[in-house]
């Protein structure tokens, strides 16, 4: 009696179970009474990453330098190429199909997490006692200067964008 279900790594066709092609190979002929499933290796710049019955291999992803992309990991017959972004840029999506310039943190904000090839800069507001007076993709919030440790006094209070201004203590004559 013809099977209605097949084992793992097999598929049902014409009332018989045929072997799937292994990763890195495509299907060129279903099995017959007289022959096993016939598979052929994927060509250069092609891949298939699963046991399959695909008649065409997938093209490796192209990391387009015009979109700021570069190859992070070269594809094989069993894996796709992995793209990442050039220095200073990051992917716009998980698939990394294009890149955008890393965001800078405005004055009053510092870098909480430096950007990577796949994630943008994460900024945070400088809390009380810290400041950032530049727009930067790298600078964290800096602590206000401690006037006391320099035997100075605060002449102008700091903000989230400016450091305190220290000055000499008023001496009693």
């Amino acid at each position: 009696e013809p099977p209605t279900a097949c084992r793992e790594k097999q598929y049902l066709i014409n009332s018989q179970c045929c072997s799937l092609c292994q990763p890195g190979q495509k299907l060129v002929s279903d099995c017959t009474e007289f022959t096993e499933t016939e598979c052929l290796p994927c060509g250069e710049s092609e891949f298939l990453d699963t046991w399959n019955r695909e008649t065409h291999c997938h093209q490796h992803k192209y990391c387009d330098p015009n979109l700021g992309l570069r190859v992070q990991q070269k594809g094989t017959s069993e894996t796709d190429t992995i793209c990442t972004c050039e220095e200073g840029w990051h992917c716009t999506s998980e698939a990394c199909e294009s890149c955008v310039l890393h965001r800078s943190c405005s004055p009053g904000f510092g870098v909480k997490q430096i950007a990577t090839g796949v994630s943008d800069t994460i900024c945070e507001p400088c809390p009380v006692g810290f400041f950032s007076n530049v727009s930067s993709a790298f600078e964290k919030c800096h602590p206000w200067t401690s006037c006391e440790t320099k035997d100075l006094v605060v002449q102008q209070a700091g903000t989230n964008k400016t450091d305190v201004v220290c000055g000499p203590q008023d001496r009693l004559r």
Epitope: Q10, S19, V28, S29, C31, T32, E33, F34, T35, E36, T37, E38, L40, T55, H56
Partner: antibody, heavy 114, light 112 residues
Framework: QVQLQESGPGLVKPSETLSLTCTVS????????VHWIRQPPGKGLEWIGV???????NYNPSLKSRVTISKDNSKNQVFLKLSSVTAADTAVYYC????????WGQGTLVTVSS | EIVLTQSPGTLSLSPGERATLSCRSS???????????LQWYQQKPGQAPRLLIY???NRFSGIPDRFSGSGSGTDFTLTISRLEPEDFAVYYC?????????FGQGTKVEIK
């Protein structure tokens, strides 16, 4: 029913290219492969190669540098070319549908001689 | 490539006798799927080969039951239980487990 018919010149000069055609009926070239097999007079059978449904090919490594198999789906024809032939290529050439091993063409004798 | 060696080269027998033909493979013909793609063909002068047995022991439709195939791995046998006059011919084993497909050199069964 499945039928295959080989045709081509019966005589080829040494160093020339042997060209044969296999015309098929009863099955579809876009969904089935076709094999070429040959048999020198009084000798055994030798698998030459196959063209698969999608146009991919496999060749016998011993002949790979000289063999080309192609096809024209619209004409139901498969073509065999064997270059730089010698007397050792004198044989009956058969075509065979993949999965139809019970049905062979009647074969065509090709003699390589000057 | 897989080499199939058939023996004997020639078998001289009388009608009604039993014929036992051997085919030995240089490596296993068992596919990873568990199937073994070993065929037997009969060929008469001036004719194309005729499929008798496929996958070691399956008789093709219309083939008389005096023909049977057996074996596994690398050793295979075609048996003709009682030779009929029309059985005198050349017999080839063939493997389609591995590309390139290969054939044995043939065993001629002739009338004694």
């Amino acid at each position: 029913q499945v039928q295959l018919q080989e045709s081509g010149p019966g005589l080829v000069k040494p160093s020339e290219t042997l060209s044969l055609t296999c015309t098929v009926s009863g099955f579809s070239l876009p969904t089935s492969g076709v094999h070429w097999i040959r048999q020198p007079p009084g000798k055994g059978l030798e698998w030459i190669g196959v063209i698969w449904a999608g146009g991919d090919t496999n060749y016998n490594p011993s002949l790979k540098s000289r063999v080309t198999i192609s096809k024209d789906n619209s004409k139901n024809q498969v073509f065999l070319k064997l270059s730089s032939v010698t007397a050792a290529d004198t044989a009956v050439y058969y075509c065979l549908g993949h999965g139809h091993f019970d049905v062979w063409g009647q074969g065509t004798l090709v003699t390589v001689s000057s | 490539e897989i080499v199939l060696t058939q023996s004997p080269g020639t078998l001289s027998l009388s009608p009604g006798e039993r014929a036992t033909l051997s085919c030995r493979s240089s490596q296993s013909l068992v596919h990873s799927s568990g199937n073994t793609y070993l065929q037997w063909y009969q060929q008469k002068p001036g004719q194309a080969p005729r499929l008798l047995i496929y996958k070691v022991s399956n008789r093709f439709s219309g083939i008389p039951d005096r023909f049977s195939g057996s074996g596994s791995g690398t050793d295979f046998t075609l048996t003709i239980s009682r030779l009929e006059p029309e059985d005198f011919a050349v017999y080839y084993c063939s493997q389609t487990t591995h590309v390139p497909w290969t054939f044995g050199q043939g065993t001629k069964v002739e009338i004694k």
